[in-house]
Protein backbone atom coordinates (compact mmCIF):
# COMPACT_ATOMS: atom_id res chain seq x y z
CA UNK A 1 0.00 0.00 0.00
CA UNK A 2 2.66 2.53 0.96
CA UNK A 3 5.03 2.49 -2.02
CA UNK A 4 7.06 5.72 -1.55
CA UNK A 5 9.55 6.93 -4.10
CA UNK A 6 11.75 10.02 -3.71
CA UNK A 7 12.54 12.21 -6.69
CA UNK A 8 14.78 15.27 -6.75
CA UNK A 9 14.71 17.53 -9.80
CA UNK A 10 15.93 20.94 -10.81
CA UNK A 11 13.44 23.81 -10.93
CA UNK A 12 12.33 24.75 -14.43
CA UNK A 13 12.61 21.20 -15.72
CA UNK A 14 9.84 19.00 -17.09
CA UNK A 15 9.13 15.99 -14.90
CA UNK A 16 7.40 12.68 -15.43
CA UNK A 17 6.05 11.09 -12.26
CA UNK A 18 5.68 7.39 -12.82
CA UNK A 19 5.81 4.08 -11.05
CA UNK A 20 8.32 1.34 -11.78
CA UNK A 21 5.75 -1.44 -12.01
CA UNK A 22 2.90 -2.08 -14.43
CA UNK A 23 -0.54 -0.78 -13.63
CA UNK A 24 -3.15 -3.32 -12.54
CA UNK A 25 -4.83 -4.86 -15.59
CA UNK A 26 -8.06 -3.21 -16.75
CA UNK A 27 -8.24 -0.84 -13.82
CA UNK A 28 -11.44 1.18 -13.45
CA UNK A 29 -10.13 4.54 -12.32
CA UNK A 30 -6.83 6.33 -11.83
CA UNK A 31 -6.42 9.57 -9.88
CA UNK A 32 -3.39 11.73 -9.21
CA UNK A 33 -3.44 13.86 -6.07
CA UNK A 34 -1.22 16.72 -4.97
CA UNK A 35 -0.70 16.32 -1.22
CA UNK A 36 -3.55 14.15 0.06
CA UNK A 37 -6.75 15.84 -0.97
CA UNK A 38 -6.13 18.01 -4.05
CA UNK A 39 -7.05 16.15 -7.24
CA UNK A 40 -4.97 16.96 -10.29
CA UNK A 41 -6.44 14.56 -12.84
CA UNK A 42 -8.71 11.56 -12.89
CA UNK A 43 -9.04 8.91 -15.59
CA UNK A 44 -12.32 7.09 -15.62
CA UNK A 45 -13.74 4.83 -18.35
CA UNK A 46 -11.59 6.08 -21.23
CA UNK A 47 -11.80 9.75 -20.29
CA UNK A 48 -9.51 12.10 -18.38
CA UNK A 49 -10.74 14.99 -16.28
CA UNK A 50 -8.31 17.70 -15.23
CA UNK A 51 -9.26 19.57 -12.09
CA UNK A 52 -8.92 23.25 -11.36
CA UNK A 53 -5.62 23.51 -9.55
CA UNK A 54 -2.29 25.23 -9.89
CA UNK A 55 -1.34 22.43 -12.30
CA UNK A 56 -4.13 23.05 -14.77
CA UNK A 57 -2.65 23.61 -18.19
CA UNK A 58 0.77 22.19 -17.35
CA UNK A 59 0.10 18.52 -16.64
CA UNK A 60 -0.80 15.60 -18.86
CA UNK A 61 -1.68 12.05 -17.92
CA UNK A 62 -0.65 8.98 -19.89
CA UNK A 63 -3.40 6.52 -18.88
CA UNK A 64 -1.52 3.52 -20.27
CA UNK A 65 1.42 3.86 -17.92
CA UNK A 66 -0.21 6.08 -15.31
CA UNK A 67 2.63 8.59 -15.77
CA UNK A 68 1.91 12.21 -14.92
CA UNK A 69 3.89 14.71 -16.95
CA UNK A 70 4.40 18.13 -15.32
CA UNK A 71 5.95 20.96 -17.27
CA UNK A 72 8.26 23.53 -15.70
CA UNK A 73 8.24 22.47 -12.06
CA UNK A 74 8.94 25.13 -9.43
CA UNK A 75 9.95 24.93 -5.78
CA UNK A 76 6.30 25.46 -4.81
CA UNK A 77 5.57 22.08 -6.44
CA UNK A 78 7.50 20.31 -3.64
CA UNK A 79 5.05 17.79 -2.25
CA UNK A 80 4.00 14.18 -2.02
CA UNK A 81 2.08 13.16 -5.13
CA UNK A 82 -0.27 10.23 -4.86
CA UNK A 83 -1.49 7.99 -7.63
CA UNK A 84 -4.53 6.00 -6.58
CA UNK A 85 -5.84 3.20 -8.76
CA UNK A 86 -9.24 1.60 -8.36
CA UNK A 87 -9.08 -1.99 -9.58
CA UNK A 88 -11.88 -3.95 -11.26
CA UNK A 89 -12.22 -5.90 -8.02
CA UNK A 90 -13.09 -2.72 -6.13
CA UNK A 91 -9.78 -2.68 -4.24
CA UNK A 92 -7.61 0.42 -4.28
CA UNK A 93 -3.87 0.56 -4.74
CA UNK A 94 -1.77 3.62 -3.99
CA UNK A 95 1.69 4.87 -4.95
CA UNK A 96 3.39 7.95 -3.49
CA UNK A 97 6.12 10.06 -5.01
CA UNK A 98 7.83 12.65 -2.86
CA UNK A 99 9.00 15.33 -5.23
CA UNK A 100 11.74 17.70 -4.15
CA UNK A 101 12.36 20.61 -6.50
CA UNK A 102 15.65 22.40 -5.99
CA UNK A 103 16.91 25.57 -7.60
CA UNK A 104 20.30 25.29 -9.27
CA UNK A 105 22.94 26.54 -6.84
CA UNK A 106 24.10 30.11 -7.47
CA UNK A 107 27.73 30.86 -8.28
CA UNK A 108 29.65 31.25 -5.01
CA UNK A 109 31.71 34.31 -4.09
CA UNK A 110 34.89 33.68 -2.11
CA UNK A 111 35.69 36.18 0.64
CA UNK A 112 39.14 36.50 2.11
CA UNK A 113 38.61 36.56 5.85
CA UNK A 114 42.33 36.41 6.74
CA UNK A 115 45.64 35.63 5.15
CA UNK A 116 48.85 35.70 7.18
CA UNK A 117 52.43 34.62 6.69
CA UNK A 118 53.62 32.91 9.89
CA UNK A 119 57.21 31.60 9.98
CA UNK A 120 57.11 30.41 6.35
CA UNK A 121 53.74 28.80 6.91
CA UNK A 122 50.61 30.38 5.50
CA UNK A 123 47.50 30.83 7.60
CA UNK A 124 44.53 31.15 5.32
CA UNK A 125 40.87 31.74 6.08
CA UNK A 126 38.50 31.91 3.12
CA UNK A 127 34.72 31.83 3.18
CA UNK A 128 32.51 30.66 0.39
CA UNK A 129 29.36 32.72 0.29
CA UNK A 130 26.08 31.88 -1.38
CA UNK A 131 22.60 33.11 -0.45
CA UNK A 132 20.87 30.87 2.16
CA UNK A 133 21.03 27.47 0.53
CA UNK A 134 21.50 23.99 1.89
CA UNK A 135 24.53 22.82 -0.08
CA UNK A 136 27.71 20.77 0.10
CA UNK A 137 31.09 22.46 -0.08
CA UNK A 138 34.31 21.14 -1.58
CA UNK A 139 37.53 23.14 -1.49
CA UNK A 140 40.39 22.69 -3.91
CA UNK A 141 43.91 24.07 -3.89
CA UNK A 142 45.23 24.22 -7.46
CA UNK A 143 42.50 21.72 -8.36
CA UNK A 144 43.51 19.23 -5.64
CA UNK A 145 40.77 18.60 -3.08
CA UNK A 146 41.39 19.51 0.56
CA UNK A 147 40.72 16.79 3.16
CA UNK A 148 37.09 15.94 3.95
CA UNK A 149 37.25 17.49 7.43
CA UNK A 150 37.87 20.91 5.87
CA UNK A 151 34.82 20.74 3.64
CA UNK A 152 32.43 23.39 4.88
CA UNK A 153 31.67 26.99 3.96
CA UNK A 154 34.86 28.29 5.58
CA UNK A 155 38.30 27.02 4.66
CA UNK A 156 40.68 27.61 7.55
CA UNK A 157 44.07 26.02 7.15
CA UNK A 158 47.78 26.48 7.71
CA UNK A 159 49.81 25.63 4.66
CA UNK A 160 53.50 24.80 4.52
CA UNK A 161 55.70 26.01 1.67
CA UNK A 162 55.72 22.62 -0.03
CA UNK A 163 51.93 22.57 -0.35
CA UNK A 164 51.17 26.22 -1.11
CA UNK A 165 48.59 26.71 -3.82
CA UNK A 166 48.21 29.75 -6.04
CA UNK A 167 44.49 29.29 -6.63
CA UNK A 168 41.69 28.17 -4.34
CA UNK A 169 38.36 26.90 -5.60
CA UNK A 170 35.14 26.47 -3.67
CA UNK A 171 32.67 24.13 -5.29
CA UNK A 172 29.10 24.33 -4.00
CA UNK A 173 26.68 21.60 -4.95
CA UNK A 174 23.27 20.21 -4.23
CA UNK A 175 21.79 17.06 -5.70
CA UNK A 176 20.87 18.78 -8.98
CA UNK A 177 23.72 21.17 -9.76
CA UNK A 178 27.13 22.51 -8.83
CA UNK A 179 29.05 25.77 -9.36
CA UNK A 180 32.61 26.90 -8.67
CA UNK A 181 34.22 30.10 -7.47
CA UNK A 182 37.98 30.58 -7.59
CA UNK A 183 40.47 33.07 -6.15
CA UNK A 184 44.18 33.28 -6.88
CA UNK A 185 46.97 34.71 -4.72
CA UNK A 186 50.08 36.31 -6.13
CA UNK A 187 52.60 35.44 -4.84
CA UNK A 188 51.35 32.72 -2.47
CA UNK A 189 50.58 34.06 1.00
CA UNK A 190 52.47 37.34 0.76
CA UNK A 191 49.38 39.43 0.35
CA UNK A 192 49.78 41.27 3.67
CA UNK A 193 53.51 42.00 3.30
CA UNK A 194 53.67 43.03 -0.33
CA UNK A 195 50.84 45.30 -1.31
CA UNK A 196 49.40 42.77 -3.68
CA UNK A 197 45.70 42.15 -3.69
CA UNK A 198 43.54 39.24 -4.53
CA UNK A 199 40.62 39.26 -6.93
CA UNK A 200 38.05 36.62 -7.69
CA UNK A 201 37.18 35.22 -11.10
CA UNK A 202 33.69 36.63 -10.57
CA UNK A 203 35.10 40.15 -10.89
CA UNK A 204 36.89 39.27 -14.10
CA UNK A 205 33.92 37.88 -16.02
CA UNK A 206 34.83 34.28 -15.34
CA UNK A 207 38.56 34.51 -16.06
CA UNK A 208 41.00 33.23 -13.47
CA UNK A 209 43.92 35.65 -13.02
CA UNK A 210 46.79 36.55 -10.79
CA UNK A 211 46.57 40.23 -10.08
CA UNK A 212 48.79 42.82 -8.45
CA UNK A 213 48.40 46.32 -7.06
CA UNK A 214 49.16 48.07 -10.32
CA UNK A 215 46.56 46.04 -12.20
CA UNK A 216 43.96 47.18 -9.71
CA UNK A 217 44.40 50.80 -10.74
CA UNK A 218 42.98 49.76 -14.13
CA UNK A 219 40.29 47.43 -12.83
CA UNK A 220 37.21 48.55 -10.95
CA UNK A 221 36.98 46.19 -7.99
CA UNK A 222 33.58 45.93 -6.21
Amino acid sequence: QGHLVHMTVVSGSNVTLNISESLPENYKQLTWFYTFDQKIVEWDSRKSKYFESKFKGRVRLDPQSGALYISKVQKEDNSTYIMRVLKKTGNEQEWKIKLQVLDPVPKPVIKIEKIEDMDDNCYLKLSCVIPGESVNYTWYGDKRPFPKELQNSVLETTLMPHNYSRCYTCQVSNSVSSKNGTVCLSPPCTLARSEQKLISEEDLGGEQKLISEEDLHHHHHH
Epitope: N14, K47, Y50, E52, K56, G57, R60, D62, K72
Partner: antibody, heavy 120, light 109 residues
Framework: QVQLVQSGAEAREPGASVRVSCKAS????????IHWVRQAPGQGLEWMGW????????NFAQKFQGRVTMTRDTSLITAYMDLSRLKSDDAAVFYC?????????????WGQGTLVTVSS | EIVLTQSPATLSLSPGERATLSCRAS??????LAWYQQKPGQAPRLLIY???NRATGIPARFSGSGSGTDFTLTISRLEPEDFAVYYC???????????FGQGTRLEIK
Amino acid sequence: QVQLVQSGAEAREPGASVRVSCKASGYTFTDYFIHWVRQAPGQGLEWMGWINPNSGATNFAQKFQGRVTMTRDTSLITAYMDLSRLKSDDAAVFYCARDVDGSGWYLDFWGQGTLVTVSS
Amino acid sequence: EIVLTQSPATLSLSPGERATLSCRASQSVSIYLAWYQQKPGQAPRLLIYDASNRATGIPARFSGSGSGTDFTLTISRLEPEDFAVYYCQQRSDWPPSITFGQGTRLEIK
Protein backbone atom coordinates in the same frame (compact mmCIF):
# COMPACT_ATOMS: atom_id res chain seq x y z
CA GLN B 1 -23.95 17.53 -27.40
CA VAL B 2 -20.98 19.87 -27.24
CA GLN B 3 -21.33 22.93 -29.46
CA LEU B 4 -19.39 26.13 -29.98
CA VAL B 5 -21.21 28.80 -31.94
CA GLN B 6 -19.27 31.81 -33.15
CA SER B 7 -20.36 35.30 -34.12
CA GLY B 8 -20.75 36.28 -37.77
CA ALA B 9 -18.30 37.61 -40.34
CA GLU B 10 -16.67 41.00 -39.75
CA ALA B 11 -15.05 43.56 -42.04
CA ARG B 12 -12.57 46.08 -40.64
CA GLU B 13 -10.13 48.71 -41.83
CA PRO B 14 -6.43 48.49 -40.99
CA GLY B 15 -5.70 49.84 -37.50
CA ALA B 16 -9.15 48.93 -36.17
CA SER B 17 -10.07 46.19 -33.69
CA VAL B 18 -12.35 43.20 -33.96
CA ARG B 19 -14.17 41.09 -31.37
CA VAL B 20 -15.21 37.50 -32.05
CA SER B 21 -17.48 35.65 -29.64
CA CYS B 22 -17.84 31.93 -29.01
CA LYS B 23 -20.90 30.59 -27.17
CA ALA B 24 -20.56 27.16 -25.61
CA SER B 25 -23.23 24.59 -24.85
CA GLY B 26 -23.53 20.91 -23.99
CA TYR B 27 -20.77 20.75 -21.36
CA THR B 28 -19.52 22.49 -18.21
CA PHE B 29 -17.98 25.67 -19.63
CA THR B 30 -15.53 26.20 -16.76
CA ASP B 31 -13.95 22.72 -17.00
CA TYR B 32 -12.18 23.16 -20.33
CA PHE B 33 -9.83 25.67 -21.91
CA ILE B 34 -11.05 27.68 -24.87
CA HIS B 35 -8.37 28.14 -27.53
CA TRP B 36 -8.35 30.52 -30.46
CA VAL B 37 -6.81 29.49 -33.77
CA ARG B 38 -6.67 31.46 -36.97
CA GLN B 39 -6.30 30.41 -40.58
CA ALA B 40 -5.39 32.87 -43.32
CA PRO B 41 -6.84 32.13 -46.79
CA GLY B 42 -5.17 29.04 -48.27
CA GLN B 43 -2.80 28.78 -45.30
CA GLY B 44 -2.30 26.48 -42.31
CA LEU B 45 -3.50 26.70 -38.72
CA GLU B 46 -1.99 29.22 -36.30
CA TRP B 47 -2.65 29.02 -32.56
CA MET B 48 -3.28 32.39 -30.90
CA GLY B 49 -3.79 31.50 -27.26
CA TRP B 50 -6.12 30.09 -24.64
CA ILE B 51 -8.31 31.19 -21.78
CA ASN B 52 -9.18 29.16 -18.71
CA PRO B 53 -12.89 30.02 -18.34
CA ASN B 54 -12.84 29.10 -14.66
CA SER B 55 -10.12 31.51 -13.55
CA GLY B 56 -9.97 33.84 -16.55
CA ALA B 57 -6.22 33.11 -16.83
CA THR B 58 -4.88 33.52 -20.34
CA ASN B 59 -1.84 32.42 -22.29
CA PHE B 60 -0.99 33.84 -25.71
CA ALA B 61 1.33 32.94 -28.55
CA GLN B 62 4.27 35.33 -28.51
CA LYS B 63 3.34 36.68 -31.93
CA PHE B 64 0.05 38.07 -30.60
CA GLN B 65 1.24 39.36 -27.22
CA GLY B 66 0.07 42.94 -26.72
CA ARG B 67 -2.52 42.79 -29.52
CA VAL B 68 -4.86 40.07 -28.40
CA THR B 69 -7.23 39.98 -25.43
CA MET B 70 -9.21 36.92 -24.39
CA THR B 71 -12.06 37.19 -21.93
CA ARG B 72 -15.10 35.18 -20.92
CA ASP B 73 -18.50 35.72 -19.37
CA THR B 74 -19.40 32.62 -17.38
CA SER B 75 -23.02 33.75 -16.95
CA LEU B 76 -23.39 33.86 -20.74
CA ILE B 77 -21.12 30.80 -21.20
CA THR B 78 -19.32 32.79 -23.88
CA ALA B 79 -15.65 33.42 -24.63
CA TYR B 80 -14.40 36.49 -26.51
CA MET B 81 -11.30 37.23 -28.51
CA ASP B 82 -10.34 40.82 -29.31
CA LEU B 83 -7.60 41.59 -31.80
CA SER B 84 -6.43 45.17 -32.07
CA ARG B 85 -4.32 47.21 -34.53
CA LEU B 86 -5.46 45.04 -37.40
CA LYS B 87 -3.25 44.71 -40.46
CA SER B 88 -4.18 43.41 -43.88
CA ASP B 89 -2.45 40.10 -43.17
CA ASP B 90 -4.73 39.55 -40.15
CA ALA B 91 -7.52 38.70 -42.60
CA ALA B 92 -8.40 35.11 -41.74
CA VAL B 93 -10.98 32.69 -40.42
CA PHE B 94 -10.81 32.72 -36.62
CA TYR B 95 -11.83 29.56 -34.79
CA CYS B 96 -12.55 28.96 -31.13
CA ALA B 97 -12.00 25.41 -29.93
CA ARG B 98 -12.45 23.50 -26.70
CA ASP B 99 -9.63 21.31 -25.50
CA VAL B 100 -10.14 17.58 -25.30
CA ASP B 101 -10.08 17.02 -21.55
CA GLY B 102 -9.20 20.19 -19.66
CA SER B 103 -5.45 19.64 -19.93
CA GLY B 104 -4.81 22.37 -22.50
CA TRP B 105 -3.07 20.02 -24.92
CA TYR B 106 -5.44 19.15 -27.80
CA LEU B 107 -8.52 20.66 -29.44
CA ASP B 108 -11.51 18.40 -29.98
CA PHE B 109 -14.56 20.62 -30.52
CA TRP B 110 -14.36 23.61 -32.83
CA GLY B 111 -16.62 26.52 -33.64
CA GLN B 112 -17.73 27.02 -37.25
CA GLY B 113 -15.22 29.83 -37.74
CA THR B 114 -15.60 33.60 -38.14
CA LEU B 115 -14.27 35.27 -41.28
CA VAL B 116 -12.57 38.60 -40.64
CA THR B 117 -11.59 40.73 -43.62
CA VAL B 118 -9.21 43.65 -43.28
CA SER B 119 -8.98 46.20 -46.09
CA SER B 120 -9.19 49.93 -46.60
CA GLU C 1 10.54 26.70 -30.32
CA ILE C 2 9.69 23.25 -31.63
CA VAL C 3 9.01 23.09 -35.37
CA LEU C 4 6.86 20.36 -36.91
CA THR C 5 7.64 19.35 -40.48
CA GLN C 6 5.10 17.28 -42.37
CA SER C 7 5.80 15.17 -45.42
CA PRO C 8 4.90 14.83 -48.13
CA ALA C 9 3.31 18.21 -48.82
CA THR C 10 0.86 16.49 -51.18
CA LEU C 11 -0.04 12.81 -51.39
CA SER C 12 -2.00 11.47 -54.37
CA LEU C 13 -3.72 8.14 -53.80
CA SER C 14 -6.83 6.25 -54.85
CA PRO C 15 -9.72 5.11 -52.64
CA GLY C 16 -8.97 1.73 -51.06
CA GLU C 17 -5.23 2.43 -50.86
CA ARG C 18 -3.22 2.86 -47.69
CA ALA C 19 -2.02 6.38 -46.79
CA THR C 20 1.04 7.08 -44.65
CA LEU C 21 1.61 10.67 -43.51
CA SER C 22 4.70 11.75 -41.62
CA CYS C 23 5.35 14.45 -39.03
CA ARG C 24 8.81 15.19 -37.67
CA ALA C 25 9.50 17.39 -34.63
CA SER C 26 12.69 19.46 -34.38
CA GLN C 27 13.14 18.09 -30.84
CA SER C 28 11.49 15.38 -28.78
CA VAL C 29 7.82 15.89 -27.89
CA SER C 30 7.54 12.49 -26.17
CA ILE C 31 4.08 11.14 -27.10
CA TYR C 32 2.38 14.54 -26.97
CA LEU C 33 1.33 14.88 -30.59
CA ALA C 34 -2.06 15.04 -32.28
CA TRP C 35 -3.43 14.75 -35.82
CA TYR C 36 -6.31 16.75 -37.32
CA GLN C 37 -8.27 16.48 -40.55
CA GLN C 38 -9.64 19.56 -42.31
CA LYS C 39 -11.95 19.59 -45.30
CA PRO C 40 -12.54 22.71 -47.42
CA GLY C 41 -14.83 25.23 -45.71
CA GLN C 42 -14.92 23.22 -42.47
CA ALA C 43 -13.24 23.46 -39.08
CA PRO C 44 -10.48 20.95 -38.31
CA ARG C 45 -11.42 17.67 -36.62
CA LEU C 46 -9.28 15.92 -34.00
CA LEU C 47 -8.39 12.39 -35.14
CA ILE C 48 -5.56 11.19 -32.89
CA TYR C 49 -4.03 12.53 -29.68
CA ASP C 50 -1.10 11.44 -27.50
CA ALA C 51 0.39 9.99 -30.71
CA SER C 52 -1.85 6.93 -30.88
CA ASN C 53 -5.20 7.48 -29.12
CA ARG C 54 -8.19 7.80 -31.43
CA ALA C 55 -10.51 10.66 -30.54
CA THR C 56 -14.18 9.91 -29.91
CA GLY C 57 -16.06 8.82 -33.03
CA ILE C 58 -12.99 8.40 -35.24
CA PRO C 59 -13.10 5.26 -37.44
CA ALA C 60 -10.62 2.46 -36.75
CA ARG C 61 -8.99 2.88 -40.17
CA PHE C 62 -7.17 5.91 -38.71
CA SER C 63 -4.19 5.06 -36.54
CA GLY C 64 -1.24 6.98 -35.17
CA SER C 65 2.19 5.84 -34.09
CA GLY C 66 5.57 7.19 -33.05
CA SER C 67 7.21 8.97 -30.14
CA GLY C 68 10.04 11.42 -29.63
CA THR C 69 10.56 13.17 -32.95
CA ASP C 70 9.01 10.90 -35.62
CA PHE C 71 5.28 10.31 -35.96
CA THR C 72 3.05 8.65 -38.53
CA LEU C 73 -0.65 8.85 -39.32
CA THR C 74 -1.88 5.82 -41.23
CA ILE C 75 -5.21 5.47 -42.99
CA SER C 76 -5.50 1.76 -43.72
CA ARG C 77 -8.07 1.91 -46.57
CA LEU C 78 -8.89 5.29 -47.99
CA GLU C 79 -12.56 6.22 -48.23
CA PRO C 80 -13.69 9.04 -50.55
CA GLU C 81 -14.40 11.26 -47.52
CA ASP C 82 -10.80 10.95 -46.28
CA PHE C 83 -9.38 13.25 -48.97
CA ALA C 84 -8.57 16.42 -47.07
CA VAL C 85 -5.69 18.32 -45.46
CA TYR C 86 -4.06 16.71 -42.41
CA TYR C 87 -2.19 18.64 -39.72
CA CYS C 88 -0.05 17.41 -36.86
CA GLN C 89 0.08 19.45 -33.64
CA GLN C 90 2.23 19.55 -30.51
CA ARG C 91 2.36 21.62 -27.37
CA SER C 92 5.50 23.35 -26.17
CA ASP C 93 5.96 23.69 -22.46
CA TRP C 94 7.28 27.14 -21.79
CA PRO C 95 5.66 29.37 -22.48
CA PRO C 96 2.83 26.91 -23.09
CA SER C 97 2.03 27.17 -26.77
CA ILE C 98 0.54 25.03 -29.48
CA THR C 99 2.12 24.63 -32.89
CA PHE C 100 0.85 22.94 -36.02
CA GLY C 101 2.71 21.39 -38.91
CA GLN C 102 2.27 23.03 -42.32
CA GLY C 103 -0.15 20.31 -43.43
CA THR C 104 -0.27 17.41 -45.91
CA ARG C 105 -2.84 17.55 -48.68
CA LEU C 106 -4.27 14.12 -49.42
CA GLU C 107 -5.81 14.21 -52.89
CA ILE C 108 -7.54 11.71 -55.15
CA LYS C 109 -5.27 10.29 -57.82
